[in-house]
């Protein structure tokens, strides 16, 4: 997988008036890395591993960059003409990647009220607009504003691309991201399925990097894909990942089944616990949280794009 840096900024308006402040999160290699602390007006690392990336250096540069980006996005939102009453959001996601062959990719995406309306490849400067008429109108609005703004010249987009890559390389130089391995915690649970059957679920949590093999075995042999259900490998908010795999088995045959896990060159096997059947409500229902937007406008539903 490529190394990536992703900026996720959101600004809000209420009854046509752009609100002060902004929400910002930065993800490094898909993990929450920085967020903008509105109270302290500073970029803050998310967890110990993020702190380790910069070591004893300050986060002033990140604070300056996020503040500047937030200000730009507020100005952009102010130029969107169709703002009706109530709450509206403008979200910008900027991503840059360095691939194994050292090739790079950069892109920028704008969302209005959670709907994508404009994308740009920052290397080719090619714009993409979805088909819907609303998206076309919004995109025209924003592109016109960006063209008017002297700052949004060709050099600006090259700079955005270069700056993002420069930052990504700076973070990678620390070696923390490349070196870091956190082994998973694995646990197996069982739940009532139907008459004579039980569902066994194997969960792996708190691991890094995200690549993992998690599969059920019967008598030491991996079950076929169609007899297993997998959950997505998702960030758990602590700079690590979580996932699960489940299968249905006949009661009384538990001893034949083990969950096999392989991660970063290490492996383990985990038997099905015997004894009382636990009745679980559901298998790890993953909810997409709104990362702080709820704090401001609890009653309003703003879609947050991951």
């Amino acid at each position: 997988e490529p190394h990536s840096l992703r900026y996720n900024l959101t600004v809000l308006s209420w009854d046509g008036s752009v609100q002060s402040g902004f929400l910002a999160e930065v993800h490094l290699d898909g993990q929450p890395f920085l967020r903008y602390d509105r109270q302290k007006c500073r970029a803050k690392p998310q967890g110990q591993w993020a702190e380790d990336v910069l070591g004893n250096k300050t986060w002033d540069r990140e604070t300056r960059d996020l503040t500047g980006n937030g200000k730009d996005l507020r100005m952009t939102l102010a130029h969107i003409k169709d703002q009706k009453e109530g709450l509206h959001s403008l979200q910008e996601i900027r991503v840059c990647e360095i691939h194994e062959d050292n090739s790079t990719r950069s892109s920028q995406h704008f969302y209005y009220d959670g709907e994508l309306f404009l994308s740009q490849n920052l290397e080719t400067e090619e714009w993409t607009v979805p088909q819907s008429s609303r998206a076309q109108t919004l995109a025209m609005n924003v592109r016109n504003f960006l063209k008017e703004d002297a700052m949004k010249t060709k050099t600006h987009y090259h700079a955005m691309h270069a700056d993002c890559l420069q930052e990504l390389r700076r973070y990678l130089e620390s070696g923390v991201v490349l070196r870091r391995t956190v082994p998973p915690m694995v646990n197996v649970t069982r739940s009532e399925a139907s008459e004579g059957n039980i569902t066994v679920t194997c969960r792996a949590s708190s691991f890094y990097p995200r690549n993992i093999i998690l599969t059920w075995r019967q008598d030491g042999v991996s079950l076929s894909h169609d007899t297993q259900q997998w959950g997505d490998v998702l960030p758990d908010g602590n700079g690590t990942y979580q996932t699960w795999v489940a299968t249905r088995i006949c009661r009384g045959e538990e001893q034949r089944f083990t969950c096999y896990m392989e991660h970063s060159g290490n492996h383990s096997t985990h038997p099905v616990p015997s004894g009382k059947v636990l009745v679980l409500q559901s298998h790890w229902q993953h909810h997409h949280h709104h990362h702080g937007l709820n704090d401001i406008f609890e009653a309003q539903k703003i879609e947050w794009h991951e």
Partner: antibody
């Protein structure tokens, strides 16, 4: 490549016990089960049981419960089968086998001949 | 326990022949059927697993088929090195059980 090297032939007296070893090489020992199979002279094969080397978990053929005990030594990548209270019925060639995770008994040891005789 | 029956205990064939060895289970084993080759020196090798999947390194002249309770192993072009005893084995239900074997000889 995967190899299972079994211990040499054993001649034991009735009532005694014997421990057959199976040393694995060419793969990560704790990744895959070790299975044991019996073949009496000129007869078919009988599955005895298997062990998960990672955690020592065992599953036995009911017929061999109390007769065979399966263990492993992770440090030497060796699996053992202990047979007790031997009788002439236990005279046979004993095989260990392992899996590649996709099929049972994928790779086999060369077999160990156990002869029970007074 | 599931009984695995190989009705033909020995079989004579000529080099180049197409040979089929059959195996019957006492109940449905859902394709969990494997075939093994045992050479006269006692060496055992996996040939086919899950009814028809060829184990890596096994010559393509070996093939397997079947479903439910009836299964077969076919050698399409018999070679000298195929002289051995062939065992079927079910992996569907514990305890795992083997057929009594079919000894293949050259005419």
């Amino acid at each position: 490549q995967v190899q299972l090297q079994q211990s040499g032939p054993e001649l034991v007296k009735p009532g005694a016990s014997v421990k057959v070893s199976c040393k694995a090489s060419g793969y990560a020992f704790t990744k895959y089960n070790i299975y044991w199979v019996k073949q009496s002279h000129g007869k078919s094969l009988e599955w005895i049981g298997y062990i998960d080397p990672y955690n020592g978990g065992t599953v036995y053929n009911q017929k061999f419960k109390g007769k065979a005990t399966l263990t492993v030594d992770k440090s030497s990548s060796t699996a053992y089968m202990h047979l007790n209270s031997l009788t002439s019925e236990d005279s046979a060639v004993y095989y260990c086998a392992t899996t590649d995770g996709y099929s049972l008994f994928t790779y086999w040891g060369q077999g160990t001949l156990v002869t029970v005789s007074a | 326990d599931i009984q695995m029956t190989q009705t033909t205990s020995s079989l004579s064939a000529s080099l180049g022949d197409r040979v089929t060895i059959s195996c019957r289970a006492s109940q449905d084993i859902s394709n969990y059927l494997n075939w093994y080759q045992q050479k006269p020196d006692g060496t055992v090798k996996l040939l086919i697993y899950y009814t028809s999947r060829l184990h890596s390194g096994v010559p393509s002249r070996f093939s397997g088929s079947g479903s439910g309770t009836d299964y077969s192993l076919t050698i399409s072009n018999l070679e000298q090195e195929d002289i051995a005893t062939y065992f079927c084995q079910q992996g569907n239900t514990l305890p795992f059980t083997f057929g009594s074997g079919t000894k293949l000889e050259i005419k």
